[in-house]
């Protein structure tokens, strides 16, 4: 008995349906396929769980989290055992492990290992303003996602005036910060964060107004 | 090598649209705002529309507003012009710019070669 | 016609200075950066000086730009007859949230 290679890993955004490729060669007749499913969760990487199970010509849930969202692709038995994993979780990231046996026909490798990442797009991010906006001061533009796989980059841009950061300013696009030097009446207007990543983009707005020193009377 | 590059022009009729494109090489196009100037035969400069770094903010010229719409595609480092009716002053060259990221106020430090608009029945 | 007004037309002799200037208001140039282009006949624009003052690199100091009020000026020393061509003024302004040319001016090197 020998299982093929896998493609080693892949990936799916949330919500979406995940195939997990195994097939496998065989000498014998498939009246006694086993075929069992588990995976080593990422968030939980000591504690593996059993996805789902073929034994005596009978398919078996596995971990309660996966019961009516996981299934073999064909009609079983057969020599491809692939499975498909339905509105993906993220809790759903891990390694997949299929372990085939078909008696009598032993020795090769029984064991297909394929990776699952579940990808988040980014959450709609938070702007916000550090520092004083006073002329001549220094400010930090700041944006952060609650949630994106992979981890969001931020990008910030102006929607206003001349359309572009000035000189001064120096963007961190994995902070998600931008801080403007010694900020004048040209830095005011309207900032927008993209945060962005494999599968998706996310934006927020930010109004920038730089105060101006108000004259002030003598008497 | 730095350079833009403008496509897309050509002899269109009045009423008629035309989407001109310019390719930029040579710098990392999603720094940088840009602009569209035009210069009708034997006339001057016109600044007729720029676009932000992503896309999010876009200025036009009264005269081209509601009927000219500026867009970017960065990965495919590509600045776009959408041309709907058409009007016989229209014709001119038209040029990508490239606004510079060391002067706070704008100051096109690239041009484009320029691509002919001919609105013309 | 353009907002920013200059000259249609200067001239001088070769060696001499030249000052071409801009005129505006107080919502585009009193307010704002100007730059200045040189464009040679049949050629695209080419940046002279931004921010009213500064020199992109490769741009001799014969060049010089100057801003005073609602007005800017731009400056040639030692005039050559390469330096004949049109010359544009360029600021953003706040009222109309556009950017705006001058209208331009020829030199002519004598």
């Known amino acids: 008995l020998e299982v093929s290679e896998s493609p080693g890993s892949i990936q799916v955004a949330r919500g979406q349906p995940a195939v997990l490729p195994c097939t496998f060669t065989t000498s014998a007749a498939l009246i006694n396929l086993n075929v069992i499913w588990m995976v080593t969760p990422l968030s939980n990487a000591n504690q593996p769980e059993q996805v789902i199970l073929y034994q005596g010509g009978q398919m078996f849930d596995g971990a309660p989290r996966f019961h009516g969202r996981v299934g073999f692709t064909g009609t079983m038995p057969a020599t491809n055992v692939s499975i498909f994993i339905n509105n993906t979780q993220l809790s759903d990231t891990g390694t997949y492990q299929c372990l085939v046996n078909n008696l009598p026909d032993i020795g090769g490798r029984n064991i297909g290992v394929t990776g699952l990442t579940v990808l988040v797009p980014p959450s709609a991010p938070h702007c916000q303003i550090q520092g004083s906006q006073d002329i001549g001061s220094d400010v930090i533009l700041l944006c952060s996602s609650e949630e994106g796989i992979p981890r969001p980059t931020y990008l910030w841009e102006k929607l206003d005036n001349t359309l572009k950061l000035p000189p001064t300013a120096t963007q961190d696009q994995v902070q998600g910060t931008v801080t403007i030097r010694n900020i004048s009446a040209l830095s005011s207007g309207l900032y927008q964060c993209v945060a962005s990543n494999a599968i998706g983009t996310s934006t927020c707005l930010l109004d920038l107004q730089v105060i101006s020193p108000q004259p002030r009377n003598i008497g | 090598e730095v350079q833009l590059l403008e496509s897309g022009g050509g002899l269109v009729q009045p009423g008629g649209s035309l989407r001109l494109s310019c390719a930029a090489s040579g710098f990392t196009f999603s720094k940088y705002s840009l602009s569209w100037v035009r210069q009708a035969p034997g006339k001057g400069l016109e600044w007729v529309s720029a676009?932000?770094?992503?896309?999010?903010?876009?200025l036009y010229a009264d005269s081209v507003k509601g009927r000219f719409t500026i867009s970017r595609d960065n990965s495919k480092n590509t600045l776009y012009l959408q041309m709907n009716s058409l009007r016989a002053e229209d014709t001119a060259v038209y040029y990508c710019?490239?606004?510079?990221?060391?002067?706070?106020?704008?100051?096109?430090?690239?041009w484009g070669q320029g691509t002919m608009v001919t609105v013309s029945s | 016609a353009s907002v920013l007004t200059q000259p249609p037309s200067v001239s001088a002799a070769p060696g001499q200075k030249v000052t071409i200037s801009c005129s505006g208001s107080?919502?585009?140039?009193?307010?704002?950066?100007v730059s200045w282009y040189q464009q040679l006949p049949g050629t695209a624009p080419k940046l002279l000086i931004y921010?009213?003052?500064k020199r992109p690199s490769g741009i001799p100091d014969r060049f010089s730009g100057s801003k005073s009020g609602t007005s800017a000026t731009l400056g040639i020393t030692g005039l050559q007859a390469e330096d004949e061509a049109d010359y544009y003024c360029l600021t953003w302004t706040g009222a109309g949230r556009i950017f705006v040319f001058g209208g331009g001016t020829k030199l002519t090197v004598l």
């Open positions: 676009i932000s770094y992503y896309g999010g903010g876009t």
């Open positions: 710019a490239r606004d510079s990221r060391d002067a706070y106020g704008v100051a096109f430090d690239l």
């Open positions: 107080s919502s585009n140039i009193g307010n704002n950066y």
């Open positions: 921010d009213n003052n």
